[in-house]
């Protein structure tokens, strides 16, 4: 057992069918000494009497809000959460498996530049009594400081049957050099607990991994003279690392038909410009990806050829 | 990338043009390796993120952009020199500053020159035959530090009587090949923003 | 007492249905996950499939995705796995177990699929 | 297809020690626990190792298992008639998992 903060507390379940539990001994917080009586959650059956009451938690019948009182006042509280451990490995029910870019993958990153700022969302099919707490780090023996905001529901969908929730945050490097070769990576660690559930989800990422960059901004279109050809060009997304000669983009420029089925042209290139031909009822897009690190292609920004 | 892109211009600092080359050169290689040693601990979760110029080159610091001069972060509290201008090209004059990050990135080459080519006498010697390091990535390495025109006092050859441990020095390739990646996209970087100058 | 009883089992044509039951007492059947094995006669144990506790996550072997479906009614302690489009390599001794790291394993039911 | 590999059959006669060996790799054995189950003929597995070297209530102490690196081993000290059987080890992948993951089966033969 171990608390997780003031007045709460974890127990760790070695969790199949008929295993003994975990005893667990709760102290009344209270000076007092004589006429204590314990009671769980809304119920007023007297569990036990004393300072100290004993319990063996096997199930989530044994978990929940424990109170000490005397003569009808309540003296404190302690909240009891189960974590189950299943054949050696922590349980996963709260969050959804993203499986990507890999099976097992709970909490997904990003970061738009290499500031030291980065998003991390998850998804659940829960709706209510949720709670998430995030902490991270860079490196975990001697811990550099990242400080992470209060994480928020930030979308919803409809998921055949189910509907599906996604929760993120956002996280700073305290100290971050964007030219910095990282040699520890940073650490996300998510405390979730469902009613009486507790579990704990971990990343372990370095920024140059999780790069997507905003898609390029400014997209236009200049035709050429007597020519069914145009020249594209672009900028840089205003959220990408400075000076951009050091920090350089490399960009891909499609072509792409009204049906999905047409061929699609693609250009590669390093500049913020590219001569491609417009056909009818075609669009244009670009996205760009680091020059020099080939992490994510940042989405696509278009613009139709008429 | 196995993605087409334009060819560089002729006129290009001719560094930029070569650390192109080795950037494209060592991610083959750690291509390679990750694939070969696929019963290994080589991906970039698995090893441990060790640089072998730490504390012996300065070169994140040495060749910092002067935009990013004044971020406090990035100073790391040592004696840093910034880049102000100028190019690798022998025509042109470079800066006291500048000849600091050119001959830390020499410095950072030879000393990983010498770390791969003892690993692959070591590999030379592996029954197993395995993987060897790609020449294109020694010869590359040569050609950079050539084109970098800097003399220093050449660092012999590593040798060790012992029995080689295989499985150790391919671990220890994996850790070279990520290390020398990450140093490989600094340079990069620098040759790029020295270009643009 | 863990108990786990099945039923189900039997000869069968290629190409048709059976389903297996896997019925649970002596424990709180909704808080556990549980497998579906089996061991084709003279051969090694392979797993089938696995449903979470409440039923929310399967997770299927290769072998059998598309064809078999696990599913459980925690209202009724059972266990269930839906088998169809059945093949001669199907044939097998089909145990249901409980998740965790001790655990209960059913009887063992006897599938024979020949024409 | 199996991916934790076991010798086929083991011997030995009353009193030896007798080893069997599960061979895996890194993303299941590697950085997963290990099972090992009894099957005499006929009937269910049993449970005999969980946790890599854990034994149940109820479970001679003359079995035991080790884990190192990707392998693990089951080890029967001084082995007796009845522990002729067919012996698996199990693991996970942790790409894979919850699904097990099963090595092909050892036949402990008791000789004399």
């Known amino acids: 057992i171990w608390e997780l903060k003031k007045d709460v507390y974890v127990v760790e379940l070695d969790w199949y069918p008929d295993a003994p539990g975990e005893m667990v001994v709760l102290t009344c917080d209270t000076p007092e000494e004589d006429g204590i009586t314990w009671t769980l959650d809304q119920s007023s059956e007297v569990l036990g009497s004393g300072k100290t009451l004993t319990i063996q938690v096997k199930e989530f019948g044994d978990a929940g809000q424990y109170t000490c009182h005397k003569g009808g006042e309540v003296l404190s509280h302690s909240l009891l959460l189960l974590h189950k451990k299943e054949d050696g490995i922590w349980s996963t029910d709260i969050l959804k498996d993203q499986k990507e870019p890999k099976n097992k993958t709970f909490l997904r990153c990003e970061a738009k530049n290499y500031s030291g700022r980065f998003t991390c969302w998850w998804l659940t099919t829960i709706s209510t009594d949720l709670t998430f707490s995030v902490k991270s780090s860079r490196g975990s023996s001697d811990p550099q400081g990242v400080t992470c905001g209060a994480a928020t529901l930030s979308a919803e969908r409809v998921r055949g049957d189910n509907k599906e929730y996604e929760y993120s945050v956002e996280c700073q490097e305290d100290s971050a050099c964007p030219a910095a070769e990282e040699s520890l990576p940073i650490e996300v660690m998510v405390d979730a607990v469902h009613k009486l559930k507790y579990e704990n989800y971990t990343s372990s990422f370095f920024i140059r991994d999780i790069i997507k960059p905003d898609p390029p901004k400014n997209l236009q279109l200049k035709p050429l003279k007597n020519s069914r050809q145009v020249e594209v060009s672009w900028e840089y997304p205003d959220t990408w690392s400075t000076p951009h000669s050091y920090f350089s983009l490399t960009f891909c420029v499609q072509v792409q038909g009204k049906s999905k089925r047409e061929k699609k042209d693609r250009v590669f290139t390093d500049k913020t410009s590219a001569t491609v031909i417009c056909r009818k009822n075609a669009s244009i897009s670009v996205r760009a990806q680091d020059r020099y690190y080939s992490s994510s292609w940042s989405e696509w920004a278009s613009v139709p050829c008429s | 990338r196995n993605l087409p892109v334009a060819t560089p211009d002729p006129g290009m600092f001719p560094c930029l043009h070569h650390s192109q080359n080795l950037l494209r050169a060592v991610s083959n290689m750690l291509q390679k390796a990750r694939q070969t040693l696929e019963f290994y601990p080589c991906t970039s979760e698995e090893i441990d993120h060790e640089d072998i110029t730490k504390d012996k080159t300065s070169t994140v610091e040495a060749c910092l952009p002067l935009e990013l001069t004044k971020n406090e972060s990035c100073l790391n509290s040592r004696e840093t020199s910034f880049i102000t201008n100028g190019s690798c090209l022998a025509s042109r004059k470079t800066s006291f500053m500048m000849a600091l990050c050119l001959s830390s990135i020499y410095e950072d080459l030879k000393m990983y020159q010498v770390e791969f080519k003892t690993m692959n006498a070591k590999l030379l010697m592996d029954p197993k035959r395995q993987i060897f390091l790609d020449q294109n990535m020694l010869a590359v390495i040569d050609e950079l530090m050539q084109a970098l025109n800097f003399n220093s006092e050449t660092v012999p050859q590593k040798s060790s009587l012992e029995e080689p441990d295989f499985y150790k020095t391919k671990i220890k390739l994996c850790i070279l090949l990520h290390a020398f990646r990450i140093r490989a996209v600094t340079i990069d970087r620098v040759m790029s923003y020295l270009n643009a100058s | 007492q863990v108990q786990l009883v099945q039923s189900g089992g039997g000869v069968v044509q290629p190409g048709r249905s059976l389903r297996l039951s896997c019925a649970a007492s002596?424990?709180?059947?909704?808080?556990?996950?549980m497998h579906w094995v089996r061991q084709a006669p003279g051969k090694g144990l392979e797993w089938v499939a696995f449903i979470r506790y409440d039923g929310s996550n399967k997770y299927y072997a290769d072998s059998v995705k598309g064809r078999f479906t696990i599913s459980r009614d925690n209202s009724k302690n059972t266990l269930y796995l839906q088998m169809k489009s059945l093949r001669a390599e199907d044939t097998a001794v089909y145990y249901c177990?409980?998740?965790?790291?001790?655990?209960?394993w059913g009887q063992g039911t006897m599938v024979t699929v020949s024409s | 297809s199996y991916v934790l590999t076991q010798p086929p059959s083991v011997s030995g006669t009353p009193g030896q020690r007798v080893t069997i060996s599960c061979s895996g790799g890194r993303s299941n054995i590697g950085s997963m626990t290990v099972k090992w189950y009894q099957q005499l003929p006929g009937t269910a597995p049993k449970l005999l190792i969980y946790?890599?070297?854990q034994r149940p209530s109820g479970v001679p102490d003359r079995f035991s298992g080790s884990k190192s690196g990707t392998s693990a081993s089951l080890a029967i000290t001084g082995v007796q008639a009845e522990d002729e059987a067919d012996y698996y080890c199990?693991?996970?992948?942790?790409?894979?998992?919850?699904?097990?993951?099963f090595g092909t089966g050892t036949k402990v033969t008791v000789l004399g």
């Open positions: 946790g890599n070297d």
């Open positions: 177990k409980t998740h965790g790291s001790h655990d209960n």
């Open positions: 002596g424990f709180t059947f909704s808080s556990y996950g």
């Open positions: 199990q693991s996970y992948d942790r790409g894979t998992h919850p699904a097990l993951l």
